[in-house]
């Protein structure tokens, strides 16, 4: 029997009946075996076919076989009901080999010319399957020349049979208190040749409950218990299953906090699998009863292990555990059925005793010592000497535990010293002056620091003075010894103040005239205001109306008196304001340089002399009574004058304070 070409030779060629294209002889038998490479098949078609027609092709025929299977037995020229001629058909081997057998019997009624056929090897597309046939691959089939391979969707792995996709369904751990798990692809058929392991692992104290839901369909057998596919449930106490078939298994109360579910499938079958809804239970904790003025959240029918609740207090109440305030409270149910924390109390917010108000006092309005939520207190300043700054002094204990003003401020009100109070209400009759009485000049400050000078108290922690009086101490403020609250220069019964900083006007030039002869001293502590220590007022915008020519101002100090010594007792003098041009002219004669008197100065004194401020009075205030407010204000600062105090035709020269209000306000607000 002639053999066709063998792989790896090129697999294509021509076959023909003996003697073709002439007629074939009787009693011929010819066999060709064609072999293609693995993964290939053979394609065959006829270009000529002319054989004797006989019933079921019993006489002459061409038979095509592939392995044990006969593909076709051909005869005649055209197909009939019982016989087949190839016509234009193409024939394919089932595998990689094709057998062709030609036979003629002992006679022919007429001559027949036989056949001519062509063949070639071609790739088999293994991925193409006939309808109703099992697919080549479980998931994805990939054809290639000479073969194919299978691959799997994510979550699956190719079985060692290279066709089946086994599910990657092990190692899943469920830790939530409830959940759902199901066979892979549920409710579609589960994969073959898979072994799935699921773990439910809850905290100790929980007990897992398994409920099979919706449908259950696992391949079974009528006689043997789950021999093919099965589901098993294992706890540390016992094993449940195996389960298979179509009946939903009953609820399983595992009494265990850990459960392992195993699902094993074989290579066959088409079943939808199973779905489990699991829950858990634990020993319940006592039902939490909210404390008075509080509520529990969330509200549940029961609370078991790991359940928690929080307590929220009503507005104006705060959480207290014993005596300790809590920002929040959450209790957690433990495995033994007890709460991990005792119930707190909702105690009314207590703002506590209100802070003392410097230079003021506080009064309980709601009731003596009542400091709880919505309680009201009233701050007030010490009468006469202090007044409350932009605040009505009424504070309420709010829910946040802070005393809060009607404007929502949590800071204390401020008691500002009342300025310009004096025991002296009218001008009386220093050089040519008279002794001050207690309370006459409570703003008077004695400044010692190399020389004796004076100043005037502003607010409760600033002193206004002359730049020339403190110039030497501008870099050593602490060297200034500041005394107030006494009339006697040599009395130990003074209130001591100390300088924190000295601010000299930037326009002042030492030893080059007295323009801008003004300075501020910041005290390192506030002084207590009383009848002997009271600040002077700064001039209002309207103050110039009380400082016109011939208006009376009062200067005070411990400076030189007519006897030529510093005064032991505070002295004062009432002096009229002098016309500015007149004063300028008085100081244009030698030895005074031109322009000695500037617009930043004012002059006061008598043309006849005898009343003046003098050395040692420098920096002190020349004060005026504001008849509208009935308060004294500083109009001038003792600055300079003639060498001989109280000289006729010469006047005391004072720094004009009203020109410096912005400078004073800026310094005080900045520092």
């Amino acid at each position: 029997t002639p053999l066709g070409p063998k792989w790896p030779e090129p697999v294509f060629g021509r076959l023909a009946s003996p003697g073709f294209p002439g007629e074939y002889a009787n009693d011929q038998e010819r066999r060709w075996t064609l072999t293609a490479p693995p993964g290939y098949r053979l394609r065959l078609y006829f270009t000529h076919f002319d054989l004797e027609l006989s019933h079921l092709c019993e006489y002459d025929f061409v038979k095509l076989s592939s392995g044990a299977k006969v593909l076709a037995t051909l005869c005649g020229q055209e197909s009939t009901d019982t016989e087949r001629a190839p016509g234009k058909d193409t024939f394919y081997s089932l595998g990689s080999s094709l057998d062709i057998t030609f036979r003629s019997d002992y006679s022919n009624e007429k001559p027949f010319t036989g056949f001519e056929a062509f063949y070639a090897a071609e790739d088999i597309d293994e991925c193409q399957v006939a309808p109703g046939e099992a697919p080549t691959c479980d998931h994805h089939c990939h054809n290639h020349l000479g073969g194919f391979y299978c691959s799997c969707r994510a979550g699956y792995v190719l079985h060692r049979n290279k066709r089946t996709c086994s599910a990657l369904c092990s190692g899943q751990v469920f830790t939530q208190r409830s959940g759902e798990l199901s066979s892979p692809e549920y409710p579609r058929p589960y994969p073959k040749l898979s072994s799935c392991t699921y773990s439910i692992s809850l905290e100790e104290g929980f007990s897992v409950i398994l409920d099979f839901v919706e449908s259950f369909d696992v391949e079974t057998h009528p006689e043997t218990l789950c021999p093919y596919d099965f589901l098993k449930i294992q706890t540390d106490r016992e094993e449940h299953g195996p389960f298979c078939g179509k009946t939903l298994p009953h609820r399983i109360e595992t009494k265990s906090n850990t459960v392992t579910i195993t699902f094993v499938t074989d290579e066959s079958g088409d079943h939808t699998g199973w779905k489990i809804h699991y829950t858990s239970t634990a020993q319940p904790c006592p039902y939490p009863m909210a404390p008075p003025n509080g509520h529990v959240s969330p509200v549940q029918a029961k609370y078991i292990l790991k359940d928690s609740f929080s307590i929220f207090c009503e507005t104006g109440y705060e959480l207290l555990q014993g005596h300790l305030p809590l920002k929040s409270f959450t209790a957690v149910c433990q495995k033994d059925g007890s709460w991990d924390r005792p119930m707190p109390a909702c105690s009314i917010v207590d703002c506590g005793p209100p802070d003392d108000l410097p230079s003021g006092r506080v009064e309980y309005i709601t009731g003596p010592g009542v400091t709880t939520y919505k309680a009201v207190i009233q701050y007030s300043c010490e009468e006469t000497f202090y007044t409350m700054k932009v605040n009505d002094g009424k504070y309420v204990c709010e829910a946040d535990g802070f005393w809060t003003s009607s404007k929502g401020e949590k800071s204390l009100p401020v008691c500002e010293p009342v300025c310009g109070l004096s025991a002296r209400t009218t001008g009386g009759r220093i050089y040519g002056g008279q002794k001050a009485k207690p309370g006459d000049f409570p703003w008077q400050v004695l400044i010692l620091g190399g020389t004796t000078a004076a100043g005037a108290l502003l607010y409760d922690n600033w002193v206004l003075t002359a730049a020339h009086a403190v110039y030497e101490q501008k870099h050593d403020a602490s060297a200034l010894d500041i005394r107030m609250g006494t009339l006697k220069r040599l009395s130990p019964h003074y209130t001591q103040a100390w300088s924190e900083a000295v601010f000299i006007h930037e326009g002042y030039t030492h030893d080059a005239g007295f323009d801008n002869d003004i300075a501020l001293i910041k005290l390192n502590n506030k002084v207590v205001i009383n009848s002997n220590i009271t600040p002077i007022c700064l001039p209002r915008k309207e103050a110039e109306s009380f400082m016109r020519t011939d208006d009376i101002g009062t200067a005070s100090g411990w400076g030189l008196t007519q006897r030529g010594f510093l005064a032991r007792n505070l002295m004062y003098v009432d002096i009229p304001i002098v016309d500015h041009q007149k004063c300028t002219a008085a100081y244009e004669k030698p030895p005074y340089p031109r322009g000695s008197v500037t617009a930043n100065m004012l002059c006061a004194g008598l043309e006849s002399g005898g009343k003046d401020s003098c050395r040692g009075d420098s920096g002190g205030a020349l004060v005026f009574l504001d008849s509208e407010t009935e308060r004294w204000f500083v109009g001038g600062i003792v600055s300079w004058g003639s060498m001989n105090c109280g000289e006729a035709g010469q006047y005391g020269v004072y720094t004009k304070v009203i020109n410096y209000i912005p400078w004073i306000e800026n310094i005080i607000s900045d520092f």
Epitope: D481, K488, P492
Partner: antibody
């Protein structure tokens, strides 16, 4: 030289009064304050009060406000301290001391020799 | 009232020793004054305004400090220095004294 000479020791019964004198010399009496202090046996120093010798203005600490009286006699440059309603705890050495007038005015640069006042029934 | 606490309350030292006495105030004081008192005698001013030596006082005595802590130092103790030492303040009314420090011969 500057000195303060105090009167001699006194023994008084409870409820009585005592008046201790302090004569100043060697300085201008009216330029200074005169302070009075006391020292109980084995104890520290306690301030009573002071008097301005120029105008007799007095200051007492709260404890002695009602029982102590400070006076001066400018003509003899003498200061006096009278303590009334004596009790046994008033037994002490009483000192007069001159107040400084050079710096803070708040310390004592010259002291009397002290007067022992014993209160005993 | 401002309380002044002296330490130590007493000390034993030898001639030539350096001795330091501290005076702690319950609140800040600007100036401290120191006095020496011998048995049966009136106190004598040693230091005024914290660090200034009073007239006639030997230079072995010195004062220092600020705020609440002040110190009296005797650089080389002499036989005549065995006495009780007091600090005094009047930054705040009323003036007060420390309880005293007794310096004895070792």
């Amino acid at each position: 030289q500057v000195q303060l000479v105090q009167s001699g020791a006194e023994v008084k019964k409870p409820g009585a009064s005592v008046k201790v004198s302090c004569k100043a010399s060697g300085y201008t009496f009216t330029n200074h304050h005169m302070h009075w202090l006391r020292q109980a046996p084995g104890q520290g120093l306690e301030w009573i009060g002071d008097i301005d010798a120029s105008d007799s203005e007095t200051h007492y600490i709260e404890k002695f406000k009602d029982r102590a009286t400070l006076t001066i006699d400018k003509s003899s440059s003498t200061a006096y301290m009278e303590l009334s309603s004596l009790r046994s705890e008033d037994t002490a050495v009483y000192y007069c001391a001159r107040g400084d007038i050079t710096t803070t005015l708040r310390y004592f640069d010259v002291w009397g020799q002290g007067t022992l006042v014993t209160v005993s029934s | 009232d401002i309380q002044l606490t002296q330490s130590p309350s007493s000390l034993s030292a030898s001639v030539g020793d350096r001795v330091t006495i501290t005076c702690s105030a319950s609140s800040s004081v600007r100036y401290m004054y120191w006095y020496q008192q011998k048995p049966g005698k009136a106190p004598k001013l040693l230091i005024y305004d914290t660090s200034n030596l009073a007239s006639g006082v030997p230079s072995r005595f010195s004062g220092s400090g600020s705020g609440t802590d002040n110190t009296l130092t005797i650089s080389s103790l002499q036989p005549e220095d065995f006495a009780t030492y007091y600090c005094q303040q009047w930054s705040s009314y009323p003036l007060t004294f420390g309880q005293g420090t007794k310096v004895e011969i070792k």
